[in-house]
């Protein structure tokens, strides 16, 4: 550890005195402290000497000597008082900057230790300290305001009692800075902008921070715009707002606009796109196929995306038939706005009934005109089957009618015994009808097909079954010949109409 001569912790001298402070160490030594230019510094072998032959109050201070090569970082210090009856204070700086909740040292050093009992801290012009100001005093270092708050950013003076009167130091400005969590918060509105050439437009870029030291600017396609800035302070935040007003937009105003704000913590930026168009537009589209097939009893949501400027003046869903003149209930129609110029319109069709198949059209209107988008909804049905015994051209024939959507295909089975449904063990014969006759096939309706099975002689202890199936399900009808006449059995599960 270096050694200072004179080897006293404090030295009190009068103005004009010669003072020599010598620091000696094992290796090279250095004097450290805030700027104290009223000294001469020179080296003498392994010692470093601070000297003045005309001490003034400005030489008052703590002088620390360190040994840079010492790994333990030892140091020695001496405090010098130059007690000037006219100058009780040596102020090392007129501005102190700290962050909130740090201790703030106001460096007014007492030039005479005897005056310590009568010192106080005041605000300039004799104003008392703010309430809850917690401070302490050290004659070596000055006044410390503990856990300084932003509101304590004031001009202070140190006061000492000399001969019954208060003598003030020059003022010290304390700047307590807010702890800045990051770059300023930004908003750029609108997030997207569309205008027809000749219309007016406004873009507002605003930034806010707990600290006033930040910059904000608006740029268009990387060109910084010269816009007057409005400043405000509310909710304990500083706000800076840039407003770009365009009375008559043209195509050169279009493009990317970026709002950029920066402070010591870094930079934030956000962008928006401004589109200038020649005239109004209205575009309808759907991510769905416009031809929809849904099983009866299930639900369906029809979705239309709308891109429009100016905004819509009207829109609605219309049922175009063919089954009834009912219209979709308004409560089933839903509109959501994705952003200013894009919307999604949804028509919910829960538990679809047969009469709800058909065409659904979404119509929208804005100053650009009318547009429509039409969906075709076909319902899928499982097959319904019926069998009758008849004579065609003198031949006994089983006639099977199957109705459903998509078009059912038909299989005949002959099995032993009387049964509602042939199982594998009973099956005697199977006929596939690859091309049943289509009896009816209208849009949005079931497809009805007919299959004929010519039977020369009906076996009385057997069952003839017509089975039909499609992608939705299957249906069957069992025909049992009895001596008194044919007897048919539709399966139990098809005794209802969905």
């Amino acid at each position: 550890i270096p050694v200072i001569e004179p080897s006293v912790p404090e030295l009190v001298v009068k103005p004009g005195a010669t003072v020599t402070l010598r620091c000696v160490g094992n290796g090279s030594v250095e004097w450290d402290g805030p700027p104290s230019p009223h000294w001469t510094l020179y080296s003498d072998g392994s010692s470093s000497i601070l000297s003045t032959n005309n001490a003034t109050f400005q030489n008052t201070g703590t002088y620390r000597c360190t040994e840079p090569g010492d790994p333990l970082g030892g140091s020695a210090a001496i405090h010098l008082y130059v007690k000037d009856p006219a100058r009780p204070w040596n102020v090392l700086a007129q501005e102190v900057v700290v962050f909130e909740d740090q201790d703030a040292l106001l460096p007014c050093l007492l030039t005479d230790p005897v005056l310590e009992a009568g010192v106080s801290l005041v605000r300039v012009r004799g104003r008392p300290l703010m309430r809850h100001t917690n401070y302490s005093f050290s004659p070596w270092h000055g006044f410390t305001i503990h856990r300084a708050k932003f509101i304590q950013s004031q001009d202070y003076q140190c006061s000492a009692l000399m001969g019954g009167r208060k003598v003030m130091s020059i003022s010290i400005r304390l700047k307590v800075q807010k702890v800045i969590p990051g770059p300023p918060a930004l908003t750029l509105v609108p997030a997207e902008l569309v205008r027809i050439r000749g219309e007016a437009a406004q873009i507002v870029c605003s930034a806010s921070s707990v600290d006033v030291n930040f910059d904000v600017f608006l740029q268009h396609n990387n060109t910084k715009l010269a816009i007057p800035q409005q400043s405000d302070f509310h909710n304990n935040r500083y706000q800076k707002v840039l407003t770009l007003n365009l009375d008559q937009v043209d195509f050169q105003h279009a493009g990317n606009y970026s709002c950029v704000a920066s402070n010591v913590q870094g930079k934030h930026s956000t962008s928006m796109f401004f589109r200038v168009v020649e005239s109004a537009y209205l575009n309808l589209s759907s991510e769905q196929n416009l031809i929809q097939e849904v099983t009866v009893g299930e639900g369906l949501n029809l979705k239309v995306m709308v891109e429009a400027y100016p905004g819509l003046q009207g829109f609605n869903w219309t049922y175009l038939g063919p089954f009834s003149d009912h219209q979709p209930e308004p409560k089933l129609a839903n509109a959501t706005t994705k952003d200013t110029y894009r919307h999604t319109f949804t028509l919910s069709l829960p538990r679809l009934k047969p009469s709800e198949a058909g065409r659904y059209s979404f119509l929208a209107r804005n100053p650009g005109g009318w547009r429509a988008l039409t969906f075709e909804l076909t319902l899928r049905y499982p097959p319904e089957v019926s069998v009758i015994w008849t004579f065609i051209n003198g031949s006994g024939t089983l006639l099977c009618a199957a109705s459903g959507y998509p078009q059912p295909n038909v299989t005949w089975l002959q099995c032993s015994g009387h049964t509602d449904r042939c199982d594998e063990a009973q099956v005697l014969q199977v006929w596939d009808d690859p091309y049943p006759e289509v009896l009816s096939q209208e849009p949005f309706h079931k497809v009805t097909v007919q299959s004929l099975l010519t039977v020369e002689t009906l076996e009385h202890n057997q069952t003839y079954e017509c089975r039909a199936h499609n992608s939705v399900g299957s249906g069957s009808w069992a025909f049992i010949p009895i001596s008194a006449g044919a007897h048919t059995h539709p399966p139990d599960e098809f005794l209802f109409t969905p």
């Epitope: 700027p35 230019p37 000294w39 001469t40 510094l41 601070l50 501005e95 460096p107």
Partner: antibody, heavy 117, light 110 residues
Framework: QVQLQESGPGLVKPSETLSLTCTVS????????WTWIRQPPGKGLEWIGY???????NYNPSLKSRVTMSMDTSKNQFSLRLSSVTAADTAVYYC???????????WGQGTMVTVSS | QSVLTQPPSASGTPGQRVTISCSGS????????VNWYQQLPGTAPKLLIY???QRPSGVPDRFSGSKSGTSASLAISGLQSEDEADYYC???????????FGGGTKLTVL
């Protein structure tokens, strides 16, 4: 030994704020005081301000209204902010260590800052 | 306009002795010590002389400084080609509470 390194953007637009950081390695910024000095192209040296670890700052009166210096002892860094810059602020900016008698014994290599739109 | 006044240029031949002057006022050189800096082309300034006449370790004793009243001077003896540089004087200014610099002297070794 102690070394200083300036960092920050080399180009700043007029009216914006110039922000520079000086990182001190090989020693602690809790000793000595630390200063910023600049040198416009082809011209002499101009002192900007200094900061001492206790928060004591002092700025050149000609720049005082635009200058803020701060210190982050946890990162061993000190920084300079110069607001509302103009082309006249184009210079090489140096950070340096200050000795007690007002001499600057260790300097960073300097960083060129151009103010231009 | 620099606070301290230096000649803009000086020159000498190798081996010669060259002196650079620096003039100030009572608020700077008159009441505080003078420091000198050497700036080689394209590099940062380097402390050459502090406290009027003290050399930091590593600075050759060919460089010496002196002060009288409100003026100071830097002398370089045995001039060498590597001494070609800009030289700046500086002193603390009490009214500024900070350092002031001279405008710099460009030394050319002929």
């Amino acid at each position: 030994q102690v070394q200083l390194q300036e960092s920050g953007p080399g180009l700043v637009k007029p009216s914006e704020t110039l922000s520079l950081t000086c990182t001190v390695s090989g020693g602690s910024i809790s000793s000595y005081y630390w200063t910023w000095i600049r040198q416009p192209p082809g011209k002499g040296l101009e002192w900007i301000g200094y900061i001492y670890y206790s928060g004591i700052t002092n700025y050149n009166p000609s720049l005082k209204s635009r200058v803020t210096m701060s210190m982050d002892t946890s990162k061993n860094q000190f920084s300079l902010r110069l607001s509302s810059v103009t082309a006249a602020d184009t210079a090489v900016y140096y950070c340096a260590r200050g000795r007690i008698i007002g001499a600057f014994d260790i300097w960073g290599q300097g960083t060129m800052v151009t103010v231009s739109s | 306009q620099s606070v301290l006044t230096q000649p803009p240029s000086a020159s000498g031949t190798p081996g010669q002795r060259v002196t650079i002057s620096c003039s100030g006022s009572s608020s700077n050189i008159g009441s505080n010590t003078v420091n000198w800096y050497q700036q080689l082309p394209g590099t940062a300034p380097k402390l050459l002389i502090y406290s009027n006449n003290q050399r930091p370790s590593g600075v050759p004793d060919r460089f010496s400084g002196s002060k009288s009243g409100t003026s100071a001077s830097l002398a370089i003896s045995g001039l060498q080609s590597e001494d070609e540089a800009d030289y700046y004087c500086a002193a603390w200014d009490d009214s500024l509470n900070g350092p002031v610099f001279g405008g710099g002297t460009k030394l050319t070794v002929l």
